[in-house]
């Protein structure tokens, strides 16, 4: 009933040895279970951290320390909502050799977006 | 406040049941998960587990798979730790604690820092 | 199964820095965690994403991760940082969590 799941941006290059987090909106559910789908096997993430902008909107973030070349593929978060599971558009996670310069694309469409945080 | 209070310490024969509980206050219950690990007299700490802040999915450690069940009561706020046959080497301090979940900002740590005092469970015949 | 793999033991005079290690062969992958345990209590987090101190810590701890190799660095150890610390970390599939066996640190 009016759920609305995304992720962003759609294609995001990094390179090798990053850290990068992955982020997901789900709004219209309260207190949704995230669950991260990497080329159709789900991820566990026993440590994974969720914003709640309130009580019908959530931010679950993926984080993966170092990205290797295993990592990259094809990620999207689903949520059960009764009985049925929804899942977001997809985001293509790239892997550039470690010291290129990395670009970030996304869709302007997905312009709500802020691109997943990179730590040091 | 964030308080876990766990229940008291129990002594207990071997081949005997138990349901220790881990009861939530100070925060919404829903938005962590809650785990367990297990410290042997005079020993380290080992993780045991965790059920995630639906209490619909729990995830062991291999040591305790099939030995122990974690659950928990979302209504009372209140995780559990069960087992079917206590053997002595269950002997330990089992604390529970508050784990990954909501949080103000994308790695802000409020989980894995707070932790109940522990119960302790002695299996003797 | 997996393990991640800490001296038993470190001692260091007041005021020298002490370093305790963390072996671990998911660690270039997974966040390395680290606890404070003193006599009698439940433990303290300390470090946390390898690096990160938590609310409350002093300055003089601080943490690195490097390869399969995370380290704990206490700057100028006090007689009050003795205690037992352990690190804490994931498998490599994040199917479930580790603990350190343990290093007694003491200060005298």
């Known amino acids: 009933a009016g759920l609305k799941l995304m992720g962003a941006p759609v294609k995001l290059t990094v390179s090798q040895g990053q850290p990068v987090k992955l982020n997901c909106s789900v709004e219209g559910m309260e207190e949704p279970d995230i669950q991260w789908v990497k080329d159709g096997a789900v991820v566990q993430n026993l440590d994974q951290l969720y914003i709640p902008v309130s009580e019908q909107h959530w931010i679950g973030f993926l984080s993966l320390k170092s990205v290797e070349r295993s990592d990259a593929g094809r990620y999207w978060c689903q949520v059960e909502d009764g009985g049925e599971t929804e899942i977001s558009q997809p985001v293509w996670l790239t892997l550039v050799p470690r010291g290129s310069s990395a670009h970030h694309h996304h869709h302007h469409h997905h312009s709500a977006w802020s691109h997943p945080q990179f730590e040091k | 406040e964030v308080q876990l209070v766990q229940s008291g310490a129990d002594v207990k024969k071997p081949g005997a049941s138990l349901t220790i509980s881990c009861q939530a206050s100070?925060?919404?219950?829903?938005?962590?998960?809650i785990s367990w690990v297990r410290q042997k007299p005079g020993k380290g700490l080992e993780w045991m587990g965790q059920i995630n802040r639906h209490a619909s999915n729990t995830m062991y450690g291999p040591s305790f798979q099939g030995h122990v069940t974690i659950s928990a009561d979302r209504s009372t706020a209140t995780a559990y730790l069960q087992w079917r046959s206590l053997e002595a080497s269950d002997t330990a301090m089992y604390y529970c604690v508050r784990s990954g979940g909501a949080t103000s900002g994308g790695t802000i740590p409020e989980y894995y820092q707070h932790w109940g005092p522990g119960t302790l469970v002695t299996v003797s015949s | 199964s997996y393990e991640l793999t800490q001296p038993p033991s470190v001692s260091v005079s007041p005021g020298q820095t002490a370093r305790i290690t963390c072996s671990g062969d998911a660690l270039p992958k997974k966040y390395a965690y680290w606890y404070q345990q003193k006599s009698g209590q439940a433990p303290v987090l300390v470090i946390y994403?390898?690096?990160k101190r938590a609310s409350g810590i002093p300055e003089r701890f601080s943490g690195s991760s490097s390869g399969t190799m995370a380290t704990l660095t206490i700057s100028g150890a006090q007689v009050e940082d003795e205690a037992d610390y352990y690190c804490y970390s994931q498998e490599r599939k994040g199917n479930y969590f580790v603990f350190g066996g343990g290093t007694k640190l003491t200060v005298l």
């Open positions: 994403e390898d690096w």
């Open positions: 100070g925060y919404t219950f829903t938005d962590y998960w």
